[in-house]
Amino acid sequence: EVEKTACPSGKKAREIDESLIFYKKWELEACVDAALLATQMDRVNAIPFTYEQLDVLKHKLDELYPQGYPESVIQHLGYLFLKMSPEDIRKWNVTSLETLKALLEVNKGHEMSPQAPRRPLPQVATLIDRFVKGRGQLDKDTLDTLTAFYPGYLCSLSPEELSSVPPSSIWAVRPQDLDTCDPRQLDVLYPKARLAFQNMNGSEYFVKIQSFLGGAPTEDLKALSQQNVSMDLATFMKLRTDAVLPLTVAEVQKLLGPHVEGLKAEERHRPVRDWILRQRQDDLDTLGLGLQGGIPNGYLVLDLSMQEALS
C-alpha cells in the first residue's frame, strides 16, 4: 500500500506522458488523478512504466472501479493486465474479441513475474474462461484467436467444455493444437471434425482428419483402409486400442500402406501389441515382418464380447 502524501508543487500530472516515467511510486500516487488515468489508458502502454510503478497505477484504477473495470479501460490495459489477479478479472465483463486479442498479445512471451517468469499466468486462464462463458460457446473466431496464442488451449478443456465447440470451429484447429489431448478429448472432437470435413474428397479429407483420429471408431478406420491413405505410424500409435483391435491384418496393411513395416519396431507397444495378440499368426506372417505373438494355427477364437451382445 502506498502512503498518501501531498503532490510536490509543479508535479501534478495534467496528462499521461513520458515525464511520469521518472516519478517515484509515491509521486505517482500523489500526483496522478485516477480519472485522468482511466480516460488516458491508451497512453499508459506507450510509456515504459516499470513493474513496480504499475502497482501504483493498478491501485488507482482499483479505487476508481471497485466493482470491476469497464471494457473501455480493459482494452487499453496493456502491460498493466499482468498485474491483475484472477479475482480482479472475475469482476470483468469482456465481450470484444479485440480486447481479448490485445490482452493475450501483451502476455505473449514476456518474463513478467519475479516468482515464475516462464509459467503460464492464471489470470490468462481466468480471462479466457470469462470471455468464453460470456459468449456461450467457442465460436470459430475465438478458437482461432486462442489457439494462435496457446496451441495447447483445446487440450486444456474438459470433454464437457469441448462439447460446446461447434463443428464449424474445427476448421481453426491445427495438428499441433491437439498434441496434448487425451483420448477422452479426442472422442468429443473427432465426430465434430468428421462433420466439419465431410464434404472434402478422400486425400484432402485424410489430411484434415488425421490429427483427430485418436477419437475414431473401428468402422471409420475400416472405411479409411479402403481409401489408400497411407497412415503414418505416429498416427496409428495414437488410435484408440479398442478401435484397432477388430481390424484385420489386411485392413491394417491397407491403412498403413508402405508404413506397415513400422509395425515391427512398435510390436511391444500399445495398440500394436494388443492388436497382434488378436490376430492369427498365419495372417501376421503374410506381412513378412517377423511379428510374433499371434494366435497359433488350429486355435479357435471365441469373441466373448460378441457372444454377450447376442445373448
Epitope: 513520458e18 516515467i21 521518472f22 517515484k24 511510486k25 506507450a46 510509456i47 515504459p48 512504466f49 516499470t50 513493474y51 513496480e52 510503478q53 504499475l54 502491460y79 499482468l82 512471451g109 514476456h110 518474463e111 513478467m112 519475479p114 517468469p117
Partner: antibody, heavy 120, light 107 residues
C-alpha cells in the same frame, strides 16, 4: 538472431556534435524500445535514454536531456543518437541495446559499441 | 536517482573458487535487479534478472539472491572464462542505474 550493428569509431572536437547509428536485424524493429548506454574509460555503465521506433516516443535521462536527440529510420531499421556540445567527459564507448519487456527494463541485447573520443 | 554500489571493486581468485559479489541499492528495489558480465572490448551480457532468475543459456554455476537493498551474485566454481567485470543494474525505477562494477581477475 537479434543483431545490433553500430557505426564505427569517431574522433570529434570539443564543442562539436556527433551522430551514432545502430542498425537492427533479426527481430521486428518497431516492437521494442531502443536504449542507449555509455561507458567512459575504466568507468561503469550510464543510461542515456530510449526511443520507441513505432511511436517515436522518447525518454531521456535529465542529465543528457538538453544535449541528446534520439531518432529512428524505420525504413532501414536504424536508430540514431545525436549528442551535442561535446566535452572530454563525453569520451566513452556508446552502446545501443534493446529491452524485450518494457516493464522489466533489463538490457536483453546489446550492440558491439561505438568508441567516441572527444579531443582537440 | 537510485544509487548502486558494489563490493569488492576488485577480486582475485583461482579457477574452482567460490566467488561472491555484493550489490547494494540506496532505496528498496524489490527484486527488480539484473546482473551482467562484461569482458574487455565486449558489450555487457545479461546473466541474471529478477535478482535470481538465470538468463537462458547462462551456466548454472551462476546464481543470484537478495531483495530490497542487498543482493549477491555467486559463482559456485570459477571457470577460466568467468574472469571479467560484473555489474548490477536496478530496474525498479527510472533512470536505470548500474553499480560501478566488480572485476574478477586471476590470483
Amino acid at each position: 538472431q537479434v543483431q545490433l550493428q553500430q557505426s564505427g569509431a569517431e574522433l570529434v572536437k570539443p564543442g562539436a556534435s556527433m551522430k551514432l547509428s545502430c542498425k537492427a536485424s533479426g527481430y521486428t524493429f518497431t516492437s521494442y524500445w531502443m536504449h542507449w548506454v555509455r561507458q567512459a574509460p575504466g568507468q561503469g555503465l550510464e543510461w542515456i535514454g530510449a526511443i520507441h521506433p513505432n511511436s517515436d516516443n522518447t525518454i531521456y535521462y535529465q542529465k543528457f536531456k538538453s544535449r541528446v536527440t534520439l531518432t529512428v529510420d524505420k525504413s532501414i531499421s536504424t536508430a540514431y543518437m545525436q549528442l551535442s556540445s561535446l566535452t572530454s567527459e563525453d569520451t566513452a564507448v556508446y552502446y545501443c541495446a534493446i529491452i524485450i519487456t518494457p516493464v522489466v527494463p533489463k538490457f536483453d541485447y546489446w550492440g558491439q559499441g561505438t568508441t567516441v573520443t572527444v579531443s582537440s | 536517482d537510485i544509487q548502486m554500489t558494489q563490493s569488492p571493486s576488485f577480486l582475485s581468485a583461482s579457477v574452482g573458487d567460490r566467488v561472491t559479489i555484493t550489490c547494494r541499492a540506496s532505496h528498496d528495489v524489490g527484486t527488480s535487479l539484473a546482473w551482467y558480465q562484461q569482458k574487455p572490448g565486449q558489450a555487457p551480457k545479461l546473466l541474471i534478472y529478477w535478482a535470481s532468475t538465470l538468463q537462458t543459456g547462462v551456466p548454472s554455476r551462476f546464481s543470484g539472491s537478495g531483495s530490497g537493498t542487498e543482493f549477491t551474485l555467486t559463482i559456485s566454481s570459477l571457470q577460466p572464462e568467468d574472469f571479467a567485470t560484473y555489474y548490477c543494474q536496478q530496474y525498479s525505477s527510472y533512470p536505470l542505474t548500474f553499480g560501478p562494477g566488480t572485476t574478477v581477475d586471476m590470483k
